[in-house]
Interface confidence: medium
């Protein structure tokens, strides 16, 4: 972002909007950093902070419990399988892990919203990084699932099924590696920062405005637009192929993955639209004023809550859309409840074949 502020010019509100920075006051600025003066004062945050204080702790606590139970159940069902996991199931296991790790950070953010950040800078970095790693991982793994389905159905290329199992693991490792890379700014720039106005400490970024905007653009593109485009492209082609082949069983088998992707889009689109408004305000394309800033802050809290809800939604979707997941869950619960009962050998007819409960390859189209 290039700031065109000429000499001998008094800065007004429209011009200072782009000059907001986030360094701590003790930072010794390098000459190449933004050199300007003086910004419009930060807006009063009373309304948005009070809203966060009331809304976020309750929501985060609920999502924490639901996410932990739901994703724990998904992981348990997948890991209880005696045979090797299919490619989609492996991705879904990693997705459950990502969602679980994300919801594990929610109690910390609940405390941050309710009172202040009391966990120190170290945990601030870890929690922030963990949160973002799993935000990105969730989106990228869904894109991987859709790409796997696309190759499998449209090109009849079972990239992971016929190849060595290491291939899907390598893909997952690449996703986690990429997410770690995306989370580097969290490790570097997040810290517990004391806010003089609020007389409270919060886990915040301490870097220049241009970095904040860049990170938001990265989040928007890598964590939402790109995965969504991949999913949309892949599933559009898959549906086209399945409709042409008039394979009703195939279409039924597609339900779960399509519903999962639609859920991702519905849950995260509102948040990213708000982030887009924030980016436009950062860049000066939209005038920043205190009223708008307050509305954006509240909208961000509500829509991010909706986004985090996605972490708890996948297990519910599997439970209600995926027949096999329900059966396996039930069997697992029975096995946990009465491990020595012979009755467990009587399996429901639809799940006698030990095929994946999410797989949509020819081997298991009847599975969902």
């Amino acid at each position: 972002m290039v700031l065109e502020v000429s000499d001998h010019q008094v800065l007004n509100d429209a011009e200072v909007a782009a000059l907001l920075e986030n360094f701590s006051s003790s930072y010794d600025y390098g000459e190449n950093e933004s050199d300007s003066c003086c910004t419009s004062p930060p807006c009063p945050q009373d309304f948005s902070l009070n809203f966060d204080r009331a809304f976020l702790p309750a929501l985060y606590s609920l999502l924490f419990l639901l996410g932990l139970l739901g994703n724990g159940a998904v992981a348990a069902v997948l890991l209880s399988r005696r045979t090797a996991l299919s490619s989609t199931d492996t991705f879904l296991l990693h997705l459950a892990v990502a969602d679980t790790l994300l919801v594990l950070t929610l109690p910390l953010w609940a405390v941050d919203a309710a009172v202040q950040w009391v966990f120190g800078s170290g945990l601030c970095k870890v929690a922030g990084a963990l949160f973002n790693i799993n935000f990105y991982a969730g989106a990228l793994l869904l894109a991987c699932i859709s790409f796997d389905r696309y190759l499998n159905i449209v090109h009849a290329t079972q990239l992971y099924r016929r190849g060595p199992p290491a291939r899907v693991t390598l893909t997952c490792l690449a996703v986690w590696g990429l997410c770690l890379l995306f989370a580097l700014p969290d490790f570097i720039f997040l810290s517990a920062h004391h806010d003089e106005r609020l007389n409270a400490t919060h886990c915040q970024y301490n870097f220049p405005q241009v970095g904040r905007t860049a990170l938001r653009v990265l989040q928007l593109v890598a964590g939402f637009l790109l995965p969504l485009l991949v999913m949309a492209y892949c599933y559009a082609h898959i549906l086209a192929v399945l409709l042409v082949s008039r394979g009703q069983r195939r279409l039924r088998a597609m339900r779960l993955v399509v519903v999962v992707v639609v859920a991702f889009a519905l849950c995260w689109t509102p948040y990213h639209l708000v982030v887009l408004v924030d980016i436009l305000m950062d860049l000066g394309a939209l005038a920043r004023n205190c009223g708008r800033e307050s509305r954006v802050d509240v909208a961000k809290s509500v829509t991010s809550g909706l986004g985090y809800m996605h972490c708890c939604l996948n297990p519910l979707l599997y439970a209600f859309v995926g027949v096999k997941f329900r059966e396996r869950m039930w069997m697992l619960l029975l096995r946990l409840g009465c491990p020595n009962q012979r009755g467990l050998q009587r399996q429901p007819s639809s799940s006698r074949r030990d095929s994946s409960w999410s797989e949509t390859s020819e081997a298991s189209y009847s599975g969902l």
Epitope: V5, D7, H8, Q9, V10, L11, N12, D13, L19, L20, E21, N22, F23, S24, S25, Y27, D28, Y29, E31, D35, S36, C37, C38, T39, S40, P41, P42, C43, P44, H193, D195, E196, R197, N206, P208, C290
Partner: antibody, heavy 123, light 106 residues
Framework: EVQLLESGGGLVQPGGSLRLSCAAS????????MSWVRQAPGKGLEWVAT????????YYPDSVKGRFTISRDNAKNTLYLQMNSLRAEDTAVYYC????????????????WGQGTLVTVSS | DIQLTQSPSFLSASVGDRVTITCRAS?????LYWYQQKPGKAPKLWIY???TLASGVPSRFSGSGSGNEYTLTISSLQPEDFATYYC?????????FGQGTKLEIK
Amino acid sequence: EVQLLESGGGLVQPGGSLRLSCAASGFTFTSYAMSWVRQAPGKGLEWVATISRGGTYTYYPDSVKGRFTISRDNAKNTLYLQMNSLRAEDTAVYYCARHPIYSGQYQGYFDYWGQGTLVTVSS
Amino acid sequence: DIQLTQSPSFLSASVGDRVTITCRASSGVNYLYWYQQKPGKAPKLWIYFTSTLASGVPSRFSGSGSGNEYTLTISSLQPEDFATYYCQQFTSSPYTFGQGTKLEIK
């Protein structure tokens, strides 16, 4: 301890010029935006000029724009105000003041002030 | 330009009194800043961000307000509080100050 010491004030004729200096110590001068604020005898405070920490940006109110120039020498930890085409209404005590940084934003209020130097414009 | 008008301009009060100084802005400001100045001395930052007391300012001082009207309150006047108080805004440039309120001993 933060210290700001102004010098260079005195009696000058209308239309004349004067250069004020402000020696800063006790803080990292290069990290802060600086300003000049004046106070006419028995009157209130009036902001005169501001310069960014690196000296790239300068800001003035309409009352002095084109006549006054703020500058700084970061190597010497010194702030300057070059005043040209002085008028009787420029008579005042001129204070050098520091802008605090809050959350990385250079704030438009002043946390430290010098003791001031008197500039009298009179024939 | 945003004009700041302080009232009253002069205020006579006794030690122990509760005193309130008002600063009205010609258009809404986000925060207000207060300075204390004693005769022959430089101003001192007294209150920033409307209600945060600067370092070393006694707790008997408080600031409040929003939008167009802000107040500085001294709960119990002490001899050292007699001075001139100025309000300042920087919501929009140029930075402007109020004309000052001189607090005198009755």
